[in-house]
């Protein structure tokens, strides 16, 4: 056959649906690879094909569009399926062509089967809500185009395996479910489950979601530097080991970069030549407020490095601060045997 | 560690504010609960305050107390109009903030509260 | 609000025997439970958190199973230091703040 620009196996876009459930799949092609829509396309007299590969098998092979009751169909750039089936998992490729042209890409449909409390090997999105921050809501997700607006489908929500019905707290809307005061114990998955008939048979849709209770930025603060501080001396003899923990709490903040950084006489410490390492770890609470520590080490100190100003940075989208480390050379212990000797020397 | 205090023999309908006072932790970063324990009864929990101030009550509370945090340090229960059977000793704890479910792992050693005309 | 129901109200157990507490909440509250020790003159102290997790520090004799309505708090071989009243709590009804404790068990360690 002749040429066709092949985008390959588009394993960004790792598709999962429920086995017994309906799903329309978009031609990947007009979404990520070209800058023309399938409009556009098909006035060019251009012609989207579908093909595919089972699972465990190499042979590429047509899609079956002649199903009882059009299990599988396409409509302009959409595969749809009504229902799926366990075996219809594999490779999809969608070709678009005519005499001069030809572009085509892959991508993996994994259809998977779900226990009756909606647990499934299926990726959940995460969507994260504001402790106590008033009323909050999460929307049944990628449920557009399967029906028209003129079907009012049934939507039953869930909690983990318990329909939410008669709660105080979370209150389903239709597609929408409404948290007024989301707390800790709101964390966990919640299920939609969408009914609704065409052609005189029943569809359900089902979406689960996990929904994670984090910080509120009501009250965020900037960062707060715990060590080092004004309580704590770094009092070393020359040739010992200098270690400077830097710890600070960031509060959660959607899309915040919280940074930690030390600097040793005003400079990184990459721009100076003593030997210096240092050591991160990061700990999180359950409502993704951050810790991060920072342990400077310089393995031998020296005279002129116990001079030196070791100050501790931090900086997130609430501020920045930072605090010196009290560091000072250790005064030797008088030699006391010494000195007693001298003193019962004089006597 | 957490303390609670103001405590003390008061006649019906005085009001009463009792204090939870907490160190080596910041209340802005934790939730706190109230409960109570009559002389020789079980454990009856009052009210709850979120990290964020927000608050919650038994429903048979109908108002007669009220949970405020004061400070970044303190929590107040106040009792708005005592009678006998609020005779008890009152607890404060802490929610350890570590799991995904709330755990009232810290509490204060309590402060009794004597009702009697 | 949710109720919990404790049962049985006192048990008597020889040492190394097998106590076995039930807690029933009057509406599904998931894995929202905790189990409680107390002493007399003491506060509680946690020893389970989402029905069947183990608190720092506390031995493996106790655990903790059940989820939706029905809970149970086991001892295997039970020590004389075990004899204490037992509290089941909801830790967050129906995901609100609601913190609804059982009526005790009174564990007697023979």
């Known amino acids: 056959s002749e040429r066709c620009d092949d985008w390959g196996l588009d394993t960004m876009r790792q598709i999962q649906v429920f086995e017994d459930e309906p799903a329309r799949i978009k031609c990947p092609l007009f979404e990520h690879f070209l800058k023309f829509n399938y409009s556009t396309a098909h006035s060019a007299g251009l012609t989207l094909i579908w093909y595919w590969t089972r699972q465990d098998r190499d042979l590429e092979e047509p899609i079956n569009f002649r199903l009882p009751e059009n299990r599988i169909s396409k409509e302009k750039d959409v595969l749809w399926f009504r229902p799926t089936l366990l075996n219809d998992t594999g490779n999809y490729t969608c070709m678009l062509r005519n005499t001069t042209y030809c572009s085509k890409v892959a991508f993996p449909l994994e259809v998977v089967q779900k226990d009756s409390c909606f647990n499934s090997p299926m990726k959940l999105p995460v969507h994260k809500l504001y402790i106590e921050y008033g009323i909050q809501r999460i929307t049944c997700p990628n449920v557009d185009g399967y029906f028209p607006s003129s079907v009012k489908p049934t939507i039953t929500w869930y909690m983990g395996c318990y329909k939410i019905q008669n709660f105080n707290n979370v209150i389903p809307e239709g597609m929408n479910l409404s948290f007024l005061i989301a707390l800790i114990s709101n964390n966990g998955n919640y299920t939609c489950v969408v009914t609704y008939p065409e052609n005189g048979r029943t569809f359900h849709l089902t979406r689960t979601l996990t929904v994670k209770v984090v910080g509120s930025p009501k009250n965020a603060v900037p960062p707060v530097i715990h060590s080092p501080n004004d309580h704590v001396v770094y009092e070393k003899e020359p040739g010992e080991e200098l270690l400077i923990p830097c710890t600070v709490y960031f509060s959660f903040l959607m899309d915040s970069r919280n940074e930690v950084w030390w600097t040793i006489d005003g400079k990184k410490p990459d721009d100076i030549t003593i030997d210096v390492t240092i050591n991160e770890s990061i700990s999180h609470s359950r409502t993704e407020d951050e810790t991060r520590t920072q342990i400077l080490s310089i393995k031998k100190v020296t005279s002129e490095d116990l001079k030196r100003s070791y100050v501790c940075h931090a900086r997130s989208a609430k501020g920045e601060v930072a605090k010196a480390a009290k560091v000072k050379q250790k005064v030797p212990a008088p030699r006391y045997t010494v000195e007693l000797a001298c003193g019962f020397g004089a006597t | 560690s957490l303390e609670e205090s103001g405590g003390r023999l008061v006649t019906p309908g005085t009001p009463l504010t009792l204090t939870c006072t907490v160190s080596?932790?910041?209340?802005?970063?934790?939730?706190m609960i109230w409960v109570r324990q009559a002389p020789g009864k079980g454990l009856e929990w009052i009210g709850f305050?979120?990290?964020?101030?927000?608050t919650w009550y038994a429903s048979w509370v109908n108002g007669r107390f009220t949970i405020s945090k004061t400070s970044s340090t303190t929590v107040d229960l106040k009792i708005t109009s005592p009678t006998t059977e609020d005779t008890a000793t009152y607890f404060c704890?802490?929610?350890?903030?570590?799991?995904?479910?709330?755990?009232?792992?810290?509490w204060g050693q309590g402060t009794l509260v004597t009702v009697s005309s | 609000d949710v109720v919990m129901t404790q049962t049985p109200a006192s048990v008597s157990e020889p040492v190394g025997g097998t106590v076995t507490i039930k807690c029933q909440a009057s509406?599904?509250?998931?894995?929202?439970l905790a189990w409680y020790q107390q002493k007399p003159g003491q506060p509680p102290k946690l020893l389970i958190y989402?029905?069947?997790t183990l608190a720092s520090g506390v031995p493996s004799r106790f655990s903790g199973s059940g989820s939706g309505t029905e809970f149970t708090l086991t001892i295997s071989g039970v020590q004389s230091a075990d004899a204490a009243t037992y509290y089941c709590?909801?830790?967050?009804?129906?995901?609100?703040?609601?913190?609804?404790f059982g009526g005790g068990s009174e564990v007697v360690v023979k």
């Open positions: 709590q909801c830790s967050g009804y129906d995901t609100t703040g609601v913190f609804p």
């Open positions: 704890a802490r929610d350890g903030d570590y799991s995904d479910y709330y755990t009232f792992d810290l």
């Open positions: 509406q599904n509250i998931g894995s929202n």
């Open positions: 989402g029905a069947s």
């Open positions: 080596g932790f910041s209340l802005s970063r934790c939730a």
């Open positions: 305050i979120g990290r964020g101030g927000s």
